[in-house]
């Protein structure tokens, strides 16, 4: 329930004045913040009208005003000069007009004694759809049908009935003739411009005699939505642009200088490289809406954004447009990790994934951002279990270290390993980050072997060799499932002679099973961690036979085989191959309430960066 | 001196209707608020709605949330009556209904008895089965 209050209905008439009272709780964040009056459209936006930090619409330019009363905790908006086409539905609030606290309040003005007047006010946004009625009478119902616009002082021919159409309005007018009953016709101007706007007239007949309306148009230009996000973040754009506009191209354009828009993303497939892999294209809904996520959030992202629909899939006169000015805080809540990770062919990498530590409970998701069409994000790992098929022993998603941070791994590496993977959760939205691994010349650090058989009954020891540079690491051996990777007994067997010039402080530490059984098949991993902060991981997968003849096995570097490519699922696994990030659990609206993130206090271990914010494979 | 008399309510059924109406006498000005209040048995009294106008014909409505959808308010023009319709009620609508009156206009907080000089005796609204 929103601690804003005001009058619900308010009713006035033609050219009288209005004050609208909103009562807020007077904290001094309340006190200060800002006060706005916006409009609440059709499709659900709210287009701000007058706010406290000096924004005046121009449809309010000269007869509107808001006063905040800090000390008695009010604002006031008088507003003069009414007319009908104030009625309508707005909100008086505090903050963020989508985000912030509010009141509805809907404002009906009614036409005043002496006020008739012949012109009839349309008020259209840009790139939308104006509708004329234009009444005639009977004797006039098999004359000629126009429209003009007054153009100066002279009256310029727009369509008319017998097929003219002006050049201005080619392929975006029509007149509409309605059935012998009713004495009206229409013209439909599609794709407004912001030119259409002003005085038209329109005529049944061409002699004393004919009926004339007059029309004034009004085109606005969308007021843009002022978003707040974190540096790092992440940002959503829900662009609602009608089902008029269902089948045309979509794009979101970020502007420049003058009235450039450059293109950020379309659904004719261009991606501007600065967004690359870090933007995605939500398919459109039936009444043509779609959403653009925006991840990895820079300063330099920071700007006025709009989004639009033309066959083009740019910006271009007539385009219906939704309009953004997104501000990047710097003073981000979200803590830096690196944004570039490498790894070597045949190594592991682990990722530190940020959420938000308020919501320690929600799922944790990884998933592989892909650029073909307009961007997806198919799931690959999630903190339930599952996993999706391909990664089967090779990927982990672990809830440590936790406390605002967790920890996804991958190993056995290989170059179509390359690209830009999302971390996110069910919870919050703006907390889903991008990093990108990199594949780089060199060698796995850890060695084993690779596939490996163990005999029904019998022992098996399989060895793994850490270099010196792990000297101070906690040593692991796992066995690895959908849920993690379960710590096994390991033990140290001394120094290693896997590595040259290495000395006395490398390692082999073996992982034994006693009397194999059929459960012990499967991946194992080794790998190094500092605490509850994960390095690098090394994976061997261990297939069970029947005995052939008695004894242990003792695995070494020399007689190990390749890891098999393909692995037979288990019957129970849970595979869901188009589990992807347009999963509609993971676009949860934002919740239109007062943003109150606490700033993230750097209990998590922090990654030198350094200015690229990368991070090696091998260095954790 | 204004004089404020309430009218109009009784027993009434779950998901039933009442309208109740206040008269003011006396004193008038151009500008008022007048609003309903309510007092359950044992509990502090409550704003329910109200409706300010100016002299030049401009009204402001104000429900709380409660009662937002279910309960109208409305003035005659002819003279100086407010009425509060009453549809959809609920047991926990049970109450002596008070109205109230303020030359204050539309510069204060009309939630608050505060801001009300003018009060009437009540009008008991029971909705039971």
């Known amino acids: 329930k929103s601690p804003i209050f005001g009058p619900e209905e308010v009713n006035s008439v033609e050219g009288n004045s209005v004050s609208i009272t909103c009562y807020y709780p007077p904290t001094s964040v309340n006190r200060h913040t800002r006060k706005y009056w916006c409009r609440q459209g059709a499709r659900g936006g709210c287009i701000t009208l007058i706010s406290s930090e000096g924004y005046v619409s121009s449809k309010y330019a000269g007869r509107a005003n808001l006063t905040n009363f800090p000390e008695n905790g009010t604002f006031v908006v008088n507003i003069a000069q009414l007319s009908q086409d104030d009625s309508g539905r707005y909100k008086c609030g505090l903050g963020i007009n989508s985000r912030g606290l509010s009141f509805d309040v809907s404002l009906e003005v009614s036409q005043g004694p002496g006020l008739l007047n012949d012109t009839k006010v349309y008020t259209v946004d840009l790139g939308r759809t104006v509708t004329i009625n234009c009444p005639f009478k009977t004797e006039n119902a098999q004359k000629r049908k126009s429209l003009y616009k007054q153009i100066g002082l002279y009256p310029v021919l727009v369509i008319d009935s017998s097929g003219y159409v002006n050049p201005n309005y080619t392929g975006r007018i029509r007149l509409d003739i309605q059935g012998t009953g009713q004495l009206l016709f229409s013209v439909v101007i599609n794709q407004l411009r912001l030119s259409d706007a002003g005085q038209y007239l329109c005529q049944a007949g061409d002699d004393s005699n004919s009926n004339k309306k007059n029309a004034d148009l009004q085109v606005l230009k969308p007021e843009p939505e002022l978003v707040y996000e974190d540096l790092r973040g992440s940002v959503t754009f829900h662009c609602a642009l009608g089902p008029e506009v269902a089948n045309v191209a979509k794009f979101l354009c970020r502007q420049s200088s003058g009235e450039n828009c450059d293109v950020v993303v379309n659904t004719l497939g261009k991606r501007a490289p600065a967004f690359e892999g870090r933007i995605l294209l939500n398919p459109q809904d039936k009444d043509g809406s779609f959403s653009v996520v925006i991840t990895g959030l820079r300063k330099e992202d920071a700007g006025r954004y709009l989004c639009g629909a033309h066959s083009d899939g740019q910006l271009q006169e007539g385009s219906p447009i939704q309009a953004w000015q997104l501000f990047v805080n710097e003073e981000s809540t979200i803590p830096r990790s690196p944004t570039v990770v490498k790894g070597v062919a045949g190594g592991s990498v682990a990722v530190l994934c940020p959420y938000n530590r308020k919501e320690s409970k929600s799922i944790k998701y990884w998933c592989l951002w892909e650029g073909a069409q307009n961007g997806r994000c198919p799931l690959l790992v999630d903190s339930e279990g599952w996993v999706k098929a391909q990664y089967e022993g090779r990927l982990s998603l672990l809830e440590e270290p936790g406390n605002g941070t967790f920890t996804v791994i991958l190993n056995q590496l290989t170059s179509r390993d390359a690209g830009f993977y999302w971390c996110l959760t069910n919870g919050d939205t703006l907390w889903r980050t991008t990093v990108e691994i990199k594949i780089i010349e060199g060698e796995p650090n850890l060695k084993v072997p690779g596939n490996v058989t163990a005999v029904l009954g019998e022992t098996l020891k399989v060895p793994c060799h850490f270099p010196c540079k792990f000297s101070s690491y906690e040593k692991y051996w796992c066995k690895w499932n959908n849920t993690g990777c379960q710590a096994l007994p390991s033990q140290d067997e001394g120094p290693s002679k896997a590595f040259v010039n290495c000395d006395e402080n490398s390692r082999l530490v073996s992982l034994t099973l006693n009397l194999v059984t059929r459960a012990d098949e499967g991946w194992y991993w080794c790998g190094v961690k500092q605490g509850h902060f994960y390095g690098e991981t090394a994976a061997v997968y261990v297939a069970v036979e029947e005995r052939k003849a008695a004894g242990s096995r003792d695995v070494s570097l020399a007689k190990a085989d390749a890891a098999p490519d393909e692995k037979v699922l288990d019957s129970g696994f849970r595979e869901i191959e188009n589990k992807a990030i347009q999963d509609p659990r993971l676009f949860a609206e934002e919740k239109a309430v007062a943003d109150t993130r606490d700033q993230a206090d750097g209990s998590r271990a922090s990654v030198d960066s350094g200015s690229s914010e990368e991070q090696g494979g091998s260095s954790r | 001196e204004v004089q404020l008399v309430e009218s109009g309510g009784g027993l009434v059924q779950p998901g039933g209707s009442l309208r109740l109406s206040c008269a003011a006498s006396g004193r008038t000005f151009s500008s008022y608020t007048m609003g309903w209040f309510r007092q359950a048995p044992g509990e502090e009294r409550e704003f329910v709605s109200a409706?300010?106008?100016?002299?030049?014909?401009?009204?402001?409505?104000y429900y709380t949330d409660t009662v937002k959808g279910r309960f109208t308010i409305s003035r005659d023009n002819a003279e100086t009556t407010v009425h509060l319709q009453m549809n959809s009620l609920k047991p926990e609508d049970t109450a002596v209904y008070y109205c109230?009156?303020?030359?204050?206009?539309?510069?204060?907080?009309?939630?608050?008895?505060?801001?009300?000089?003018?009060w009437g005796q009540g009008t008991l609204v029971t909705v039971s089965s």
């Open positions: 109230a009156a303020s030359s204050s206009g539309t510069y204060g907080d009309p939630r608050s008895e505060r801001e009300y000089r003018y």
């Open positions: 409706i300010s106008w100016s002299s030049d014909g401009t009204y402001y409505k």
